[in-house]
Amino acid sequence: CRTSECCFQDPPYPDADSGSASGPRDLRCYRISSDRYECSWQYEGPTAGVSHFLRCCLSSGRCCYFAAGSATRLQFSDQAGVSVLYTVTLWVESWARNQTEKSPEVTLQLYNSVKYEPPLGDIKVSKLAGQLRMEWETPDNQVGAEVQFRHRTPSSPWKLGDCGPQDDDTESCLCPLEMNVAQEFQLRRRQLGSQGSSWSKWSSPVCVPPENPPQPQVRFSVEQLGQDGRRRLTLKEQPTQLELPEGCQGLAPGTEVTYRLQLHMLSCPCKAKATRTLHLGKMPYLSGAAYNVAVISSNQFGPGLNQTWHIPADTHTEPVALNISVGTNGTTMYWPARAQSMTYCIEWQPVGQDGGLATCSLTAPQDPDPAGMATYSWSRESGAMGQEKCYYITIFASAHPEKLTLWSTVLSTYHFGGNASAAGTPHHVSVKNHSLDSVSVDWAPSLLSTCPGVLKEYVVRCRDEDSKQVSEHPVQPTETQVTLSGLRAGVAYTVQVRADTAWLRGVWSQPQRFSIEVQVSD
């Protein structure tokens, strides 16, 4: 027989299958060109001295063989005596160590046994009922396929899975989705219903993120408020990168985790926009307001768990930057203007109460007045800061109020609302003898003292009821006692106390009468 032909004679070895565990297996035959065919197989066991023979039986019952020698691959043409248009049965017999080992048979029509392409181009990945769904366009003119997938994680070897039969212009596969680790998938195809047909190559890797994006483990710090009323938010710790399987390292489209920073400005609730989402790499400047900051991780399956921080308001106060004048028509605030065409947000809340009770007002964009001041006025009827209590006031400014990251703090200070003159009047004024010519005057702290920086001083007035002479004694706002000396025994005096703010003189307390008794010597 010629080596290029299938030999229709008995093979040159005895016909007996040893039934051993080793031997030829996994025979695959397919058409490689218009007139050529190839069969290949695996051989399990020691290969020294092994001779392989490809056996073929035609539908007529006639059988032949090709001698492959030690090779496990053999090519032949459509003129080799094997009928390519009709079904044939093929197997491999391996002669080794005086025994014959036989592979399982495959029955196929060689003409139509074409090696398929793997999924080409774009493989779409989506999530379906907790599983992964991959979908791709069937390679042209190769409809009708069996499809397999293999997948691995960074710490596990390849595992094989089956997609089932496909018979459409688009093919798809349901695969397991890992909760917390990235996976690499590859797909391959072969002709449907053709026993012994050859698998295609594996497709390019498809890199799939975990169902849950990793929770961002980051830390922030906030710098001090600068002269411009802004403070920088800085990232102390970058989010950890996702560990990827081998084939997804380097360029791994599909596994990307994006981290976004969501800012929620809690102060000044009357502004147009309270939240803003930024890329994590772009760290913003913030005003001195209170913020909630969330870092949101997301991948192609959507957002994951977020990590949230509270950034408290900067409570540094300006002692004199705010000027308040109270008139019959209402109250006006003045402060150094920031720039032309600025929108200001004035926020106030009673001291010692929950931050949720803050009230605010947004001004129309305004230019500085001739004195370089910005103003905000309100009438008594509006009820703004109308109660006689201490308010914490913060003023924010922005040239672009719709942009959350462009607000700055102008000032923070305290203000006593309502009729501060009357409300601040000290009560419980008492006089005690101190010496032969002096008394100690005590009083309960003014309500104004609950408002840091508001109470400028106390003034104690002493009036000699005989001579009508009046003396006034300034007292530090932290003191609630003063000693009046140089008094004369037997003379009637009245004493009063008032509490003054920087812009307002207080109302005198009720007059308190006293006298120093004349001492009679024995």
Epitope: N112, V114, N141, V143, D168, D169
Partner: nanobody
Framework: EVQLVESGGGLVQTGGSLRLSCAAS????????MGWFRQTPGKEREFVGE??????????ADSVKGRFTISRANAKNTITMYLQMNSLKSEDTAVYYC??????????????????WGQGTQVTVSS
């Protein structure tokens, strides 16, 4: 569904050449192979040749081998198959049909393996 339309038939001298075209439209990605058949009056359709579209593999009847060549061109949603006929003989006179099949089993030389057929184009070779 797949539609097939042949063109290019005509009258040609013995020894001459002719090129037939078959345009396939519709659900063309599902076609795995396209073939040419011919028929003369009172006879059955005879296999001429076939092309496996995804690979370009061809197969010819012995009577045309070496003279006829099948090729194909793919565009989006259309496939055109060509039959280049050289060294024509008077016995090549027939109506030429284009056919398409969607399954991988069966003998391509048999008409019943093909699901779709064109309307045919006449080729006449005169001496």
């Amino acid at each position: 569904e797949v539609q097939l339309v042949e063109s290019g038939g005509g009258l040609v001298q013995t020894g001459g050449s002719l090129r037939l075209s078959c345009a396939a439209s519709g659900r063309t990605p599902s076609i795995i192979a396209m073939g040419w058949f011919r028929q003369t009056p009172g006879k059955e359709r005879e296999f001429v040749g076939e092309i496996i579209l995804s690979k370009g593999f061809t197969y010819y009847a012995d009577s045309v081998k070496g003279r006829f060549t099948i090729s194909r061109a793919n565009a989006k949603n259309t496939i055109t198959m060509y039959l280049q006929m050289n060294s024509l003989k008077s016995e090549d006179t027939a109506v030429y049909y284009c056919a398409a099949r969607q399954n991988w089993s069966g003998n391509p030389t048999r008409t019943n393996e093909y699901e779709y057929w064109g309307q045919g184009t006449q080729v006449t070779v005169s001496s």
